[in-house]
């Protein structure tokens, strides 16, 4: 999270790290005690998920190995539309003041609603500075049309924007598939940004996750 | 001003191991947040990429050659090597060392243009 | 592998010239696709990344465009130092990334 700030303690108990062994992949959230939602270009054969602290390493963390994760089926590497995947757990989520399932939308939430990005990427960018604590920082989404300006084609109609005029506030490397959430409900999961992260009237891009709910809930009733 | 210098040995015999090292000065490649490879181009010419790795130590390689290729960092130095086995003459060639500029982060991070160069060095294969 | 094919492989045109090498990827490849220009001995220089953003330090006589499979890169008017061989690569997230096979822009 580039020009945040450390997150209030266990202000975001749905957040979740996915770690490659010991090391940051990507973020996540837990939508019930046994589904994940991240983004699908973080695809791995299996994951370690820190749940239940703000504190990477925090022994009083619950980690939980998950080997099986559903992609989207219209995702693709190249435009990267339909950026979601779904990540079951090998075993089940203990829910507790810490850990708990996130809000999914039942509307879209409109442009300059203000929202709240969250991870443990780096804080920094080109040269990478990873914090062990939770990172927040408050964006705006940003309109289709406004949006477009800037990433013309590469823009596709799943995707959502957000950030602050003239202001290098935004999510970058090992914050993907973390959330996005507007009025406590998870609206976006990040997707990408130009390089380096944070330059000023380059918004973060993210996965609209209010056009997806009816397949999160297909695919978790599916893979029960 | 970032800037890389590809050294090794000039000549090496059929059947052997060419070894190639890229030292980086003006920026470190433990902590910077871009890939780091190498080119070759064989006399006369054009450009094929051999493989990359990235700061955190996950390589990529040419499938064509992967068999054969080894590339990794040594973060104290601030270097980072090739090693090519079981070479023969069509391995006759100018190796490039470059860094990786990612085009975004998150779903983009993967994808990269060269954006600094070595002055390549010339690797002749012959006994 | 996806096949990246330049043409012309060579052309000869003058200084102040409008020249225009194209660059045809055998599947889509977005808007993933670089430029560089080599002069001889040398090693090559990123000139385009993305299909169309400029290097910096790049003269903004050099642009480039496309998307998908069929991509352009134009010089608006040739300088003396612009003679030069002019590669085009693809940079998928998964290997090999792969290199034009080179346009030669020499002097009439």
């Known amino acids: 999270i580039i020009d945040g700030a450390p997150c209030a303690r266990g202000s975001h108990p749905w957040q979740v790290a996915l770690l490659s062994g010991n090391q940051l992949h990507c973020g996540g959230v837990l939508v019930n005690e046994r589904w994940v939602l991240t983004a699908a270009h973080c695809k791995m054969n299996e994951y370690t998920v820190h749940l239940g602290s703000d504190t990477l390493g925090d022994r009083r963390a619950q980690r939980i190995k998950a080997s099986k994760s559903f992609r989207h089926p219209g995702y693709s590497t190249q435009t990267h539309v339909n950026d979601l995947m779904l990540v079951k757990l090998n075993s089940q989520a203990r829910l507790s003041s810490m850990v708990k399932k996130v809000r999914l939308p039942s509307r879209c939430e409109p442009p300059g609603t203000t929202c709240t990005v969250s991870g443990w990427g780096t804080t920094t960018s080109p040269d990478v500075t990873f914090p062990s604590d939770l990172m927040c920082v408050d964006v705006k989404l940003i309109s289709p049309q406004d949006c477009t300006k800037v990433y013309k084609d590469l823009l596709e109609n799943s995707m959502l924007c957000a950030g602050i005029p003239d202001s290098k506030k935004n999510a970058c490397n090992g914050d993907a598939g973390g959330p996005l959430v507007c009025r406590g409900t998870l609206q976006g999961l990040v997707s990408w940004g130009t390089f380096p992260c944070g330059q000023p009237n380059d918004p973060g891009v993210y996965t609209q996750v209010c056009k997806f709910t009816k397949w999160i809930n297909d695919t978790m009733k599916k893979h029960r | 001003q970032l800037q890389l210098q590809e050294s090794g040995p000039g000549l090496v015999k059929p059947s052997e191991t060419l070894s190639l090292t890229c030292t980086v000065s003006?920026?470190?490649?433990?902590?910077?947040?871009?890939?780091w490879g190498w080119i070759r181009q064989p006399p006369g010419k054009g450009l094929e990429w051999i493989g990359s790795?990235?700061?955190?130590?996950?390589?990529y390689y040419n499938p064509s050659l992967k068999s054969r290729v080894t590339i990794s960092v040594d973060t104290s130095k601030n270097q980072f090597s090739l090693k090519l086995s079981s070479v023969t003459a069509a391995d006759t060639a100018v190796y490039y060392c470059?860094?990786?500029?990612?085009?975004?982060?998150?779903?983009?991070?993967?994808?990269?243009?060269?954006?600094?160069w070595g002055q390549g060095t010339t690797v002749t294969v012959s006994s | 592998d996806i096949q990246m094919t330049q043409s012309p492989s060579s052309l000869s045109a003058s200084v102040g010239d409008r020249v225009t090498i194209t660059c045809r990827a055998s599947?889509?490849?977005?808007?993933?696709l670089n430029w560089y220009q080599q002069k001889p001995g040398k090693a090559p220089k990123l000139l385009i990344y993305?299909?169309?953003s400029l290097q910096s330090g790049v003269p903004s006589r050099f642009s480039g465009s496309g998307s998908g499979t069929d991509f352009t890169l134009t010089i608006s008017s040739l300088q003396p130092e612009d003679f030069a061989t002019y590669y085009c690569?693809?940079?998928?997230?998964?290997?090999?990334?792969?290199f034009g096979g080179g346009t030669k822009v020499e002097i009439k």
């Open positions: 599947q889509s490849i977005s808007s993933y």
């Open positions: 003006g920026g470190s490649i433990s902590s910077s947040d871009y890939y």
């Open positions: 690569q693809q940079s998928p997230p998964f290997p090999p990334l792969t």
């Open positions: 993305s299909a169309s």
């Open positions: 790795i990235y700061y955190s130590g996950s390589t």
């Open positions: 470059a860094r990786g500029r990612p085009l975004g982060y998150g779903a983009r991070h993967y994808y990269y243009g060269m954006d600094v």
